[in-house]
Amino acid sequence: TQDVREPPALKYGIVLDAGSSHTSMFVYKWPADKENDTGIVGQHSSCDVRGGGISSYANDPSRAGQSLVECLEQALRDVPKDRYASTPLYLGATAGMRLLNLTSPEATAKVLEAVTQTLTRYPFDFRGARILSGQDEGVFGWVTANYLLENFIKYGWVGRWIRPRKGTLGAMDLGGASTQITFETTSPSEDPDNEVHLRLYGQHYRVYTHSFLCYGRDQVLQRLLASALQIHRFHPCWPKGYSTQVLLREVYQSPCTMGQRPQTFNSSATVSLSGTSNAALCRDLVSGLFNISSCPFSQCSFNGVFQPPVAGNFIAFSAFYYTVDFLKTVMGLPVGTLKQLEDATETTCNQTWAELQARVPGQQTRLPDYCAVAMFIHQLLSRGYRFDERSFRGVVFEKKAADTAVGWALGYMLNLTNLIPADLPGLRKGTHFS
């Protein structure tokens, strides 16, 4: 007979990413004996919750909790029974709930209460439902990307920790209601709100991060729609031949469009709006989202927000990825340079509704909006974050790394479960996010 080594025991963790437009559940797993290695935690499975984000249930909070049941039932199947009790379960809500909290703290509390009630009914080790700050969202996305790409440490053949310090990757996240940019920088921040110091695997990281509320994909589209409605005739970013009835209440209920709300309007009224496929006017419409004229610091991105020059390589994920992937795969256009991205955007924006539909078999609900989002992404990167051709060459658009979705969820779990030690093994334990 021969000794057969048993496979190492696996541990599991679950994170519910409660975004503004929808909720996703991620189940992670890792070998119990390698908890402190970098890149060892990976995605076991995922599930997209049907329906809107939890903030969309503000008027019926119990449905927010109910909406999660289908995915939680899947988690029961994905995680071995004997691991249920030791599997941490977290729910993190992002900008959709931050916006709801601005307008209705009571409704926000009720929604969180409802999801908590649902989550506590499951046999997992539920550790709370909370709203992440924009800074959390940015930093945890950065941690996720660099952890998965093993940029923090390497395990050497001599059994010692070898730190390559090969440089970290900046992270850009485009959600439904906010967008985040996070990158390691050598220059001290002129605004303490944008600086985070991390100690990971014995290394110190000075990280710049900022989250722009109301600059997520869906809120940008609502703001552009509100601008078009102010003029009441057409939408230059929508394709010619496309028209729809716009319910005014839906446009103006967001805090992001409050400034564009008419003094008096019939909240139940609908307005017919048509597209004109006018790339030039769409560019001007989008440029109105960025105030680059005033900066109280030595350098800014936009809206008076401090930002040092972008440095190093970046990964752009979530809606950045989906939009650029559309330009590449559906439109068949190159996007390797800023100039090409501008070209691809212009080409997309000049397409008629019939031309766009011909490229996409079957009705695609988001089809009319790709022009506006692509235009926004181009301007956000070039005018907003000030990427030039040289720095843009270091940007990759991806949704996954090492077969795991890139987003804040993994970094959030790694932090809360102390899976990233602040110091090298044998020295000190415990993650320090200061």
Partner: antibody, heavy 120, light 109 residues
Framework: QVQLVQSGAEVKKPGSSVKVSCKAS????????VSWVRQAPGQGLEWMGR????????QYAQKFQGRVTITADESTSTAYMELSSLRSEDTAVYYC?????????????WDQGTLVTVSS | SYELTQPLSVSVALGQTARITCSGD??????VYWYQQKPGQAPVLVIY???NRPSGIPERFSGSNSGNTATLTISRAQAGDEADYYC???????????FGGGTKLTVLG
């Protein structure tokens, strides 16, 4: 075919203001932006600013910020450029130009210009 | 602020090729436009997006743009090509147009 027609030549005193008009015809005024460009005698072209009539958005060259105001009246398809605190160096031909949606926002239609002379 | 630099003048023999340059920091990253202006007339767009000709502009006019230099090339130069030529670019960062100082093209012979 879009055509632009500007107001006539002006002679102004230093310190005063001038308002030049630019009327568009033969196209939809709300489907493009209008820029103002000036050219002093024997000198090159100098961009002053632009307006997107449909949105009311304006952008100005740093050099003219605070001294130039560009407006538009959609009902008459007319753009206006007002320059205040005139000095002799402002003597120039002032052009309005359409930013073409077809040629990536470059200026494809110009008027013959308005000569503004600033002299005491 | 962003600046575009052009030679004051360029001369070319009738029927030969004229090249007018326009230099600016990393101008290859931006789109460049060329305008022709004859005495007493308004400028006319001859090249857009670095190397595209509007309808009605002869094929003899072409453009290129890379690195720090954009070039307008006029092949088989004719007497009627004698004019001032201006390059221009849109500075997206500052949301403004920038013109070069202009080049006077003289066709000899």
């Amino acid at each position: 075919q879009v055509q632009l027609v500007q107001s006539g030549a002006e002679v102004k005193k230093p310190g005063s203001s001038v308002k030049v008009s630019c009327k568009a015809s033969g196209g939809t005024f709300d489907s493009y932006a209008v820029s103002w460009v000036r050219q002093a005698p024997g000198q090159g072209l100098e961009w002053m600013g632009r307006i997107v009539p449909w949105l009311g958005h304006t952008q100005y060259a740093q050099k003219f910020q605070g001294r130039v105001t560009i407006t538009a009246d959609e009902s008459t398809s007319t753009a206006y450029m007002e320059l205040s605190s005139l000095r002799s160096e402002d003597t120039a031909v002032y052009y309005c130009a359409r930013e073409s949606p077809g040629y990536r926002y470059s200026f494809d239609v110009w008027d013959q210009g308005t000569l503004v002379t600033v002299s005491s | 602020s962003y600046e575009l630099t052009q030679p004051l003048s360029v001369s070319v023999a009738l029927g030969q090729t004229a090249r007018i340059t326009c230099s600016g920091d990393a101008i290859g990253e931006k789109y460049v436009y060329w305008y022709q202006q004859k005495p007493g007339q308004a400028p006319v767009l001859v090249i857009y997006d670095d190397n595209n000709r509007p309808s009605g502009i002869p094929e003899r006019f072409s453009g290129s743009n890379s690195g720090n230099t954009a070039t307008l090339t006029i092949s088989r130069a004719q007497a009627g090509d004698e004019a001032d030529y201006y390059c221009a670019s849109y500075d997206l960062q500052q949301a403004r147009w920038v013109f070069g100082g202009g080049t006077k093209l003289t066709v000899l012979g």
